[in-house]
Interface confidence: low
Amino acid sequence: KKVVLGKKGDTVELTCTASQKKSIQFHWKNSNQIKILGNQGSFLTKGPSKLNDRADSRRSLWDQGNFPLIIKNLKIEDSDTYICEVEDQKEEVQLLVFGLTANSDTHLLQGQSLTLTLESPPGSSPSVQCRSPRGKNIQGGKTLSVSQLELQDSGTWTCTVLQNQKKVEFKIDIVVLAFQKASSIVYKKEGEQVEFSFPLAFTVEKLTGSGELWWQAERASSSKSWITFDLKNKEVSVKRVTQDPKLQMGKKLPLHLTLPQALPQYAGSGNLTLALEAKTGKLHQEVNLVVMRATQLQKNLTCEVWGPTSPKLMLSLKLENKEAKVSKREKAVWVLNPEAGMWQCLLSDSGQVLLESNIKVLPTWSTPVQP
């Protein structure tokens, strides 16, 4: 018996071939011997089966001795043994129809779970293997679960259903709703304007929700809400903003925040949350601000950084075009009695400069100049 696998909602063509290459009488029946369709001369005739409005054949092939049964908009319950009667012979074809659906919306928040459910005919014992867009393979039976969805899981999931050594492939488009970056860090000199950007890693026609930026300054004992905003059809409107600092927010996507000045008291970490309409849970992006200050007080030249730096980072003070005078894995370094000239304060990671601040040290009778 020939086995054919079909996909729910698709069209399947079951073949039936006569030895004579001409139009002769044929009938297609189901396992209950109920006639589905056949011919009377060159006319297609249909029986009383439940497939009546979804069954068809290809008249153009009859003259070649081919009498296919075409079933449109397949349903799981169409799974059956179909019998083609032609030339006093019977050809049996077993059709097995499968469906694969995502248990929830195909737009899921990062960190949520995806469950794929296989609909299969009674008596079948299929195996399923799905491949995520990043090449991860997941195997299962009637259900497949993927917990903790990541941004790279966005895209087309290809699932292969295997039954009787035959396979059928399903493609499901999954969109993981997330920010492009889980975390970002901004390095700024004291006084500079700070730009925070929160690009989304997906595009949808209409985007509505609300968001908030909570900030934990390094110098503060508790975190505070810096800004709250609404998102309506990709338009951003500020609801509430602190007076210090007074953030400005762009009116369009991507979400964009401007801090007029980087100051030591603002250095720290923030968490931007975005709650989307009709979605449970929130999107998160962490943002970090590191602020550098170089100062000269009497005979002491000091370089300091505030904010979430790691011990891997090197803080240095050097006279321009010379070797570093001091270089430490610390948040503050200083030089006593610095010689006159342009001094550089550098924050670097494995030799790569992340932040630089210059200060001009004048001969001892004058005051320092900060360029």
């Epitope: 990043r134 090449g135 790279q152 966005s154 895209g155 969109v175 492009q180």
Partner: antibody, heavy 124, light 107 residues
Framework: EVQLVESGGGLVKPGGSLRLSCAAS????????MNWVRQAPGKGLEWVSF????????YYADSVKGRFTISRDNAKNSLYLQMNSLRAEDTAVYYC?????????????????WGQGTMVTVSS | DIQMTQSPSSLSASVGDRVTITCQAS??????LNWYQQKPGKAPKLLIY???NLETGVPSRFSGSGSGTDFTFTISSLQPEDIATYYC?????????FGQGTKLEIK
Amino acid sequence: EVQLVESGGGLVKPGGSLRLSCAASGFTFSSYSMNWVRQAPGKGLEWVSFISSSSSYIYYADSVKGRFTISRDNAKNSLYLQMNSLRAEDTAVYYCARERGDDYGDYEGAFDIWGQGTMVTVSS
Amino acid sequence: DIQMTQSPSSLSASVGDRVTITCQASQDISNYLNWYQQKPGKAPKLLIYDASNLETGVPSRFSGSGSGTDFTFTISSLQPEDIATYYCQQYDNLPYTFGQGTKLEIK
């Protein structure tokens, strides 16, 4: 038509500098991670540097670390490679290459679009 | 760094032949492997990504398989236009690394 066009190659003395540019067209440049890959005459391919779509992540091969700087200007649809302290062993055809992806994000690692390459010769 | 060892380094075959190139990674790279074709004087071209996926527009005579440390690239029926150097490349870890290449010639 999706394409990448490199420029800026040429003959330079050891210790010298060059700045390579790569102009992108036909796709949303700001959505894709980009790379520089080089090929010394008669030799194989060597990955040089990577930059993510919004420049958050930058990586270099050990052989160029501290001497080369990758950057991009998404407003100008351009990728750059600043090469300082050049050595004879940096002589190669330099290709800019796009990482496979789409407007939602990138799929790490496969270079689906390449430029025609620009020749850099370091010789005294 | 992950080393990629390709073999053979050169190969001579006739039109219509089945051609196989292998690539071995110095550590498990799952299926994070791509195959490229480079014709003389031209830029490389992506043929296979994720070890076995055929890039859009690439003829079906090209295929790839393997996982972990051992990978295979196959041309089912060699055509004259397939004369080129073929490279494997891993992207399990930065730095991305390429195999040394396999130069394919027609007998």
